[in-house]
């Protein structure tokens, strides 16, 4: 999530940032660590069967402002958190799925316990 008072126009970092990556490792990553000029992220979303899937990795500076904003997408439960304060800071991010809305019960898949 963005820090209070952080400007919306992304300013270039003076140095590269290393992030943990999982299910989202680019080709240039090594030992599940990627590099970026932008943000580290951790995201949780539902897969097609309604199971929560956690991915993490690097977001480049270009477009990261939009991607880290976590705008709700209709019919999709997803939450993303971004950070830059230290290397591998996304190890400590634990986004949670937004609560189900009533219409999701109607439109979404039926889960049996």
């Amino acid at each position: 999530k963005k820090e209070d008072g952080e400007s919306t126009a992304p300013t270039p970092r003076p140095k590269i940032l290393r992030c943990k990556c999982h299910h989202h490792c680019p080709e240039d990553s090594v030992n599940n660590i990627c590099s970026t000029d932008g943000y580290c992220f951790t995201m949780i979303e539902e897969d097609d069967s309604g199971m929560p899937v956690v991915t993490s990795g690097c977001l480049g500076l270009e477009g990261s402002d939009f991607q880290c904003r976590d705008t709700p997408i209709p019919h999709q439960r997803r939450s993303i958190e971004c950070c830059t304060e230290r290397n591998e800071c996304n190890k400590d991010l634990h986004p949670t799925l937004p609560p189900l809305k009533n219409r999701d019960f109607v439109d979404g898949p039926i889960h049996h316990k």
């Epitope: 240039d28 970026t36 480049g60 230290r86």
Partner: antibody, heavy 116, light 112 residues
Amino acid sequence: QVQLQQPGAELVKPGASVKLSCKASGYTFTSYWMQWVKQRPGQGLEWIGEIDPSDSYTLYNQKFKGKATLTVDTSSSTAYMQLSSLTSEDSAVYFCARFGYYIEYWGQGTTLTVSS
Amino acid sequence: DVVMTQTPLSLPVSLGDQASISCRSSQSLVHSTGNTYLHWYLQKPGQSPKLLIYKVSNRFSGVPDRFSGSGSGTDFTLKISRVEAEDLGVYFCSQSTHVPFTFGSGTKLEIK
């Protein structure tokens, strides 16, 4: 202006360890990575590893894991590289270098001689 | 590890001539951010390397405009339009896209 000060030379015996220093000035020490590079005559440049002084996060070239240990002292804006179990293969010039997305500035290098 | 192959190893030139150095990488240097982290350095005898060009084609501050860099992917070139005496030394290409970062073996620019 940016300066990275390194001792000119070190002479150590085989099997011993040595701690090379690199004192940074002219910029905010924690805002850039510090890298270490080895140069042997006729062998080109070899990247040893890097440390982020803001959180002491390190990345090493697999080849130098167990040989080199990188540390920093932010209070004195100094980076260190300890080299252990020295052999004649470790005789070389060792550079520290300021890194953002590429090496911008290099120290003058420390010539390490391993000899009995 | 990414292998950086520089050619030629030695480049004899006359002062005022154009010089061209090639650098090829064993894999693409396009980073996942879209940047290409390929850089050029000059090392004069008894000195540390100095940055000339960063990210393929950007001249570092204080570097004369007779130095230019070009290329993409795996194939890169450094050109010196009119060689001056102060340009003599060993030129290295370097990549910081893939860990471990690697360097070319160097090209020695010398007087013919």
